[in-house]
Amino acid sequence: LQDLCSNCPAGTFCDNNRSQICSPCPPNSFSSAGGQRTCDICRQCKGVFKTRKECSSTSNAECDCISGYHCLGAECSMCEQDCKQGQELTKKGCKDCCFGTFNDQKRGICRPWTNCSLDGKSVLVNGTKERDVVCGPSPADLSPGASSATPPAPAREPGHSPQ
């Protein structure tokens, strides 16, 4: 019995109703390995999911997220709502990043601006909700003899942007 079933290829199952012959997987099911006694149910890409790859008798369907959502988890097991840049998703929906933080993507959380002074540098471009600060040369590098066409913005920590 074991040997008979091991001969059943992917896309079939070993059917005990028929003296262990290999039967094709029923509609909407698949077996990706040989010797299976029951085929697995195809994943359905419904609701916020859309089909990226159709199910076949030997491989499962693959899902993506519809517009306005992005995949989370292994094999896109969940779809999470997109937010705008400068926002993060909370239990109450998309919220603007707090002052001193930014998010340059449609997903993920707001992160603190870089603290330029920790690297001994100054703020070259102020941070916003959507963008991190840009750190410039350290104040010591900004001697009168230094070749700089335009003076940098005054150093403000952690970087100021009117919001």
């Epitope: 005990n16 029923p26 509609p27 990706s32 010797g35 006694r37 697995d40 149910i41």
Partner: antibody
Amino acid sequence: QVQLQQSEAELVRPGASVKISCKAFGYTFTNHHINWVKQRPGQGLDWIGYINPYNDYTTFNRKFKDKATLTVHKSSSTAYMELSGLTSDDSAVYYCARTWGHWYFDLWGRGTVVTVSS
Amino acid sequence: EIVMTQSPATLSVSPGERATLSCRASQSVSSNLAWYQQKPGQAPRLLIYDSSTRATGIPARFSGSGSGTDFTLTISSLQSEDFAVYYCQQYNNWPPWTFGQGTKVEIK
């Protein structure tokens, strides 16, 4: 002897979780899906979902997707179902059952009684 | 999801008589239907699968028929051990696999 042996009855508090087990004897564990079925006292049968021990693939009844987590431990031929956020509605007998061929259940465990009470 | 409706809810039959149980699906399930027997305090037991095939060890007095939406389980001559609750279950196409609410066969 081919059988599915389930864990003993559980009495749990509302809001808690419980993990019940189903150990397979007499057949190759990875060859057959393990399904879980709920039966409330004096009521009918409700299919929760299955796990394929060969590849850990799971399929759920949508209404149990956030309630039940299905896992297997291949080396001990044991399937587990964890139920979380328990309420009185989760008080029931839970059966594990095997499939072979199409998705009918040819072998059943004796059931685990879960009682949710404060 | 496919809804399975069994009738009657209770069937009173004398030992030795014939019992006919009905199961109707809300949409076609082809021949993908099983019947189970459950006695008090016990797990269900598979009787019939694929609408009409008897499971291993099931006596010949149990027979199943039907396809599409209408199915019948017949017990040709009821024995004392046959008094129980009987459930139908569809396993067609997509899950969830669904059961009927059961028919209780009791002694008349």
